[in-house]
Interface confidence: medium
């Protein structure tokens, strides 16, 4: 089937970066400036994306691939292919309709994006709070209160839980 189609359809021979020009006897013509075709056999070239305003050009458009955008400093990408830019906040804040607002007591955000999340409840795991939480950091849970009582067997206490959102260094 593919062989038959290629014999009947001269456009299938046009490579990426060109289009099949019906105005010129279906000759493969290069994509005009500021356009591209990422696959062969196309009858038109697509207009290149322009990274304007809050968008910055991360990768220039070529005849075979679209431009790629990211966001200007102070903003981060949202959506497939960075379709939108959202403003950063400071750690310890979240973005609301009223702009960047501090995390409420009992919540934290250790990133410049996303929402404030509740501190870990250490007691749910039978542990105690080793380090108090802040707006920027989760609490650190330590050994259970029973492990700290006098006469408890001397076992090595477990390592503090890793803070959410952080990968090991």
């Amino acid at each position: 089937f593919e062989r038959t189609r290629s014999l009947q359809d001269p456009c299938s021979n046009c490579p990426a970066g060109t289009f099949c020009d019906n105005n010129r006897n279906q000759i493969c013509s290069p994509c005009p400036p500021n356009s591209f075709s990422s696959a062969g056999g196309q009858r038109t070239c697509d207009i290149c994306r322009q990274c304007k305003g809050v968008f910055r050009t991360r990768k220039e458009c070529s005849s075979t691939s679209n431009a790629e955008c990211d966001c200007t400093p102070g903003f981060h990408c949202l959506g497939a292919g960075c379709s939108m830019c959202e403003q950063d906040c400071k750690q310890g804040q979240e973005l609301t309709k009223k702009g960047c607002k501090d995390c409420c007591f009992g919540t934290f955000n250790d990133q410049k994006r996303g929402i404030c999340r509740p501190w870990t409840n250490c007691s749910l795991d039978g542990k105690s709070v080793l380090v108090n939480g802040t707006k920027e950091r989760d609490v650190v849970c330590g050994p259970s209160p029973a492990d700290l009582s006098p006469g408890a067997s001397s076992v090595t206490p477990p390592a503090p839980a890793r803070e959410p959102g952080h990968s090991p260094q």
Epitope: G53, G79, M84, C85, E86, T96
Partner: nanobody, 123 residues
Framework: EVQLVESGGGLVQPGGSLRLSCAAS????????MIWYRQAPGEELEWVAN????????YYVDSVKGRFTISRDNATNSLFLQMNSLRAEDTAVYYC????????????????WGQGTTVTVSS
């Protein structure tokens, strides 16, 4: 083509007033939140104010509260920023931007921007 075009900038003395306009075309203006941003020389973009689809919700950065007023006219697809009691620190390029169509999923992103209009406050 989706487009935003700002106008109304200029040179004004401290304490003076300006009214910025933003003309929208190519999309259903009344479906979207709209936002004003500004960028002072050598600084990052700063959010100034935003307004919801029907104009019933308006929010401002602290530094302009009581001096700036954001408004919109959905009949003419226009966004406005009335700036009173201007200060030297308000000097910047002001941009209007299209926000979300409901701010769903905590996304406060912008996808369409104007070319900006320059406001200079100087004596």
């Amino acid at each position: 083509e989706v487009q935003l075009v700002e106008s109304g900038g200029g040179l004004v003395q401290p304490g003076g007033s300006l009214r910025l306009s933003c003309a929208a075309s190519g999309f259903t203006f009344s479906d979207y939140w709209m936002i004003w941003y500004r960028q002072a020389p050598g600084e990052e973009l700063e959010w100034v104010a935003n307004i919801n689809q029907d104009g019933s919700e308006k929010y401002y950065v602290d530094s302009v509260k009581g001096r700036f007023t954001i408004s919109r006219d959905n009949a003419t697809n226009s966004l406005f920023l009335q700036m009173n009691s201007l200060r030297a620190e308000d000097t910047a390029v002001y941009y209007c931007a299209r926000g979300g169509d409901g701010y769903s999923n905590s996304h406060y992103g912008m996808d369409v921007w104007g070319q900006g209009t320059t406001v200079t406050v100087s004596s």
